[in-house]
Structure formats: structure tokens, C-alpha cells
């Protein structure tokens, strides 16, 4: 037997107790599929929230954060301070890098430069507390007379030829 | 801003035909099903038809079944109320009004005289 | 359907004054019921929705009560544009309906 239930569409709520089973959608409520038993209440994206979308009858709000604040977590649950670009949050706020650790984005951790020794490289650029440092060749490709290694030329696509 | 606005009312005979519009705009008009109101001159409201959002599902109120018919075009952002074998007793201002019953339009007025 | 019946038909106060308007339901409706208000010449505007919720942009004064099937609008105070025609509808079953309307006219 089919659920009669399941003629209710997206928008509105279904009652199995009553002959009339579809009712629309309070206000600030939607159900986004039909055959539904409750209309969810809306997301209200306040204070440090913004509204992205508004709620409709069948569908949620979206919010995403303020300007100076990001999102965190699956649907933009939580909004997280941004620190400048050299700078992480911690408790007391928005902390510089140690030295020896950047941080390029105004999210997330300082993250430890990139040890270049470590793969038989030399350190090309510095690190900055924004900036990791960037690795260049080998001390051994640096030495007199090891040859310079020239790209190969790109290969010709097969197939069409000049019409 | 949202809003509602109706038109195509006006002066039909008995019997006639009319067909009204409502345009929308300010919300995701795809995303809500809407209703017909309406309001005889110096009376009460009275609920006429309502339209789900993507079309599928529709009521009507006993006065009108089988006469009156209710359409959307999401691409148009526009709801439509075909009004057919028209009485007397359908003189009134129709509004359209989005289906949390929120929003109206500011009414269009339909007359059946002869 | 279900028929609501709004008492009494017409309120004569004077601004500031208290107005108490009931909505009774024939048969339970839940906590479906809005409050609207209408003046001439214009659409209605919602006022309270699930019986009781003020809508956006609402002053205070406005306070809806009840479920099942009496229903109370209350106006704390009256404000000169207060003066209106208020409505209840029920959206618990198809159709929806309203009831015949209250009159707050001045005294």
C-alpha cells in the first residue's frame, strides 16, 4: 500500500491522523522533500553569521560569516576569527609565527618551513613567517662543472596536420 | 525586497473568461508554492487555489473547481490564474500571496457584469 | 472545511487602550493559525503566524495566544494606525480559510 504521505509535496507536511493530510509550511519552516511528517524550523544566521540564501518553503537558509571571520565545520556551523597572513588564533587571539614556521593563509596553524636538507636541497629563498622558504638544487648541481640540464622539446600532438 | 504583482483584472460578462498574472521577485520564487486569494468588495478573504513549487500539486477551493485553473512558470518567475464560465459571485480583488501566506501582492480587481 | 469564527465583529477603543480579539476554530486546528491585519484599500499583512510567533518587523505590542481551537490576538496599546480590520486563518488543512474579520475602529 502506498503512503498517502506521499503525495505531500516539498513545502508542505503530512499528517496520517487527519483525512486532509497536506498542510503548508509555516512561516520560517520548510520541508525540502516530499512525504514529510514536520516542517524544519528555519536557519536564522545571526550575529557573526550572515545569510548566503534565505530559507524558503522547501528549502534551509545557508550561512556563511562575516567579513574578517571564516567558516568552520559542514555547513558553515561555526564562524572562526581570520588572523592576518603570518599570524594563527590561539586562545588570547591571533599570535605571529615562531620563527621557523608561516602561515600564507588568515586561516589555520603556522606551519614549520620545509626542511630543503632533507631532500639534498639547498634553501634558494628564505622563510618569512608568511612565506615558506623555497628550495633550490642540490649542493652537488651547484659545483663547477656539473652540466645544466636543458628541458626536452614538447612532443607534437598526434593526429590533425596543418589543413 | 519581496514582491507580488498582480494583474490582468478587469470588466468580463457572465460566463466569460479571464486570466490572471502575478509576478514575483525578491525571493527564489522556484523554491515556494503559492496561493490565490481573494476578497469579494467589502467582504472576507477567501482561499481560491494553491500551486506547489515545482507544479506537481494543486487544490481548489469547491467554489471554483472545475472552473478555475492555476499555473506557474518558474523560468518566468510568474503565477498564472486561468478563470473560466465566470459568475457574478467572483467579483472580488485577487491576490496572490507566497505559500507561508507572508507576502501579498496588491490586488487585482476582477468585475463579472453584464 | 473548517470555519473560524472571529468575535466580536467590530471594537471601538480609543488609543492606548488594551484590544483583546478571539479566533475559535470548529474543529482542532494545532497552533496553525495567523493573525493579519488589513486597511483600506491595501493587502493583509501578517502579523503573527504558529499562533503566537510575532513575523519579522512586528512591533511587540502584538502578542498571539492559544491552540486547539480558541485563539487570542492582543494589541497592548493602541497606536493611531493600529485602527484596522484583523483577520485569523487557519493553514492546518486544505482549504485554507479566514475568519469574517474584527473591525478596531475608534471610539
Known amino acids: 500500500l502506498q503512503d498517502p504521505c506521499s503525495n505531500c509535496p516539498a513545502g508542505t507536511f503530512c499528517d496520517n491522523n487527519r483525512n486532509q493530510i497536506c498542510s503548508p509550511c509555516p512561516p520560517n519552516s520548510f520541508s525540502s522533500a516530499g512525504g514529510q511528517r514536520t516542517c524544519d524550523i528555519c536557519r536564522q544566521c545571526k550575529g557573526v553569521f550572515r545569510t548566503r540564501k534565505e530559507c524558503s518553503s522547501t528549502s534551509n537558509a545557508e550561512c556563511d560569516c562575516t567579513p574578517g571571520f571564516h567558516c568552520l565545520g559542514a555547513g558553515c556551523s561555526m564562524c572562526e576569527q581570520d588572523c592576518k597572513q603570518g599570524q594563527e588564533l590561539t586562545k588570547k587571539g591571533c599570535k605571529d609565527c615562531c620563527f621557523g614556521t608561516f602561515n600564507d593563509q588568515k586561516r589555520g596553524i603556522c606551519r614549520p618551513w620545509t626542511n630543503c636538507s632533507l631532500d639534498g636541497k639547498s634553501v634558494l629563498v628564505n622563510g618569512t613567517k608568511e612565506r615558506d622558504v623555497v628550495c633550490g638544487p642540490s649542493p652537488a648541481d651547484l659545483s663547477p662543472g656539473a652540466s645544466s640540464v636543458t628541458p626536452p622539446a614538447p612532443a607534437r600532438e598526434p593526429g590533425h596536420s596543418p589543413q | 525586497e519581496v514582491q507580488l504583482v498582480e494583474s490582468g483584472g478587469g470588466l468580463v460578462q457572465p460566463g466569460g473568461s479571464l486570466r490572471l498574472s502575478c509576478a514575483a521577485s525578491g525571493f527564489t520564487f522556484s523554491e515556494f508554492g503559492m496561493h490565490w486569494v481573494r476578497q469579494a468588495p467589502g467582504k472576507g478573504l477567501e482561499w481560491v487555489a494553491y500551486?506547489?513549487?515545482?507544479?506537481?500539486?494543486?487544490y481548489y477551493a469547491d467554489s471554483v473547481k472545475g472552473r478555475f485553473t492555476i499555473s506557474r512558470d518558474n523560468a518566468k518567475n510568474s503565477l498564472y490564474l486561468q478563470m473560466n464560465s465566470l459568475r457574478a459571485e467572483d467579483t472580488a480583488v485577487y491576490y496572490c500571496?507566497?505559500?507561508?501566506?507572508?507576502?501579498w501582492g496588491q490586488g487585482t480587481l476582477l468585475t463579472v457584469s453584464s | 472545511e473548517i470555519v473560524l469564527t472571529q468575535s466580536p465583529a467590530t471594537l471601538s477603543l480609543s488609543p492606548g487602550e488594551r484590544a483583546t480579539l478571539s479566533c475559535k476554530a470548529s474543529e482542532n486546528v494545532g497552533s496553525y493559525v495567523s493573525w493579519y491585519q488589513q486597511k483600506p484599500g491595501q493587502a493583509p499583512r501578517l502579523l503573527i503566524y504558529g499562533a503566537s510567533n510575532r513575523y519579522t518587523g512586528v512591533p511587540a505590542r502584538f502578542s498571539g495566544s492559544g491552540s486547539g481551537t480558541d485563539f487570542t490576538l492582543t494589541i497592548s496599546s493602541l497606536e493611531p494606525e493600529d485602527f484596522a480590520v484583523y483577520y485569523c486563518?487557519?493553514?492546518?488543512?486544505?482549504?485554507?480559510?479566514f475568519g469574517g474579520g474584527t473591525k478596531v475602529e475608534i471610539k
Open positions: 500551486i506547489s513549487s515545482g507544479g506537481s500539486t494543486i
Open positions: 486563518g487557519q493553514s492546518y488543512s486544505y482549504p485554507l480559510t
Open positions: 500571496a507566497r505559500d507561508w501566506v507572508d507576502y
